[in-house]
């Protein structure tokens, strides 16, 4: 629980508690913003980002965005609040422990995004269908 000597200041979004009343500590995420990438046609890739940051707010999760156009491939790694859209998309998989890439519709490019909530989980980005719970066969296995 929040110790009594730690002030709960007014309008403070920095002190977040979980269901047990414990203070929610922030995520550690890869945070290199946008970098050129060689990740292409692979089941999974490492971010090759050497910067691990303490997310500024405890509610933030790790995010990775993979983009490919006619000129290059980039990988973006950041912390972001899942209550807010990122690149105009909701972070629907924010509670996942793994960063499972899902394709999003963006004109003129191939655009994949994932979010996750375990330490440095955006270091390993997964494209493989075997991890993707939108795969009907996998759903069948899960619910059997």
């Amino acid at each position: 629980t929040i110790p009594p000597h730690v002030q709960k200041s007014v309008n403070n979004d920095m002190i977040v508690t979980d269901n047990n009343g414990a203070v929610k500590f922030p995520q550690l995420c890869k945070f290199c913003d946008v970098r050129f990438s060689t990740c292409d046609n692979q089941k999974s890739c490492m971010s090759n980002c050497s910067i691990t940051s303490i997310c500024e707010k405890p509610q933030e999760v790790c995010v990775a965005v993979w983009r490919k156009n006619d000129e290059n491939i980039t990988l973006e790694t950041v912390c972001h609040d899942p209550k807010l859209p990122y690149h105009d998309f909701i972070l629907e998989d924010a509670a996942s422990p793994k960063c499972i890439m899902k394709e999003k519709k963006k004109p003129g490019e191939t655009f994949f995004m994932c979010s996750c909530s375990s330490d440095e989980c955006n270091d390993n980005i997964i494209f493989s269908e075997e991890y993707n719970t939108s795969n009907p066969d996998l759903l069948l296995v899960i619910f059997q």
Partner: nanobody, 116 residues
Framework: EVQLLESGGGLVQPGGSLRLTCAAS???????RMWWVRQAPGKGLEWVS?????????YYADSVKGRFTISRDNSKNTLYLQMNSLRAEDTAVYYC?????????WGQGTLVTVSS
């Protein structure tokens, strides 16, 4: 009983240095990631730095990168924060904290005041 006792705070001029110490007892120190967290007057918590159980990996908030260094001596159950190039905005109560999935433990804090 888990105890965390911070020391080393005080009044320092801008550009100066301080070393904070956190003495831990009542738990297996080598099991836990440890944190330094600060709270400026009337403000929220700011997560300053963290260190993994064996001290191999360290993490910093952007606001202190390159100025603060976290370390630990597992043989002495002690956590440290070396603070250099201190600024007025570093003025806060500094807490050491430990955390696992269910519980968090906090020290009473030590006040750092950076002022000329």
């Amino acid at each position: 009983e888990v105890q965390l006792l911070e020391s080393g705070g005080g009044l320092v001029q801008p550009g100066g240095s301080l070393r904070l110490t956190c003495a831990a007892s009542g738990f297996t120190f080598t099991d836990d990631r440890m944190w330094w967290v600060r709270q400026a007057p009337g403000k929220g918590l700011e997560w300053v730095s963290a260190i993994d159980p064996q001290g191999q990996h360290t993490y910093y908030a952007d606001s202190v990168k390159g100025r603060f260094t976290i370390s630990r001596d597992n043989s002495k159950n002690t956590l440290y924060l070396q603070m250099n190039s201190l600024r007025a905005e570093d003025t806060a109560v500094y807490y050491c904290a430990k955390h696992n999935s269910s519980f968090d433990y906090w020290g009473q804090g030590t006040l750092v005041t950076v002022s000329s």
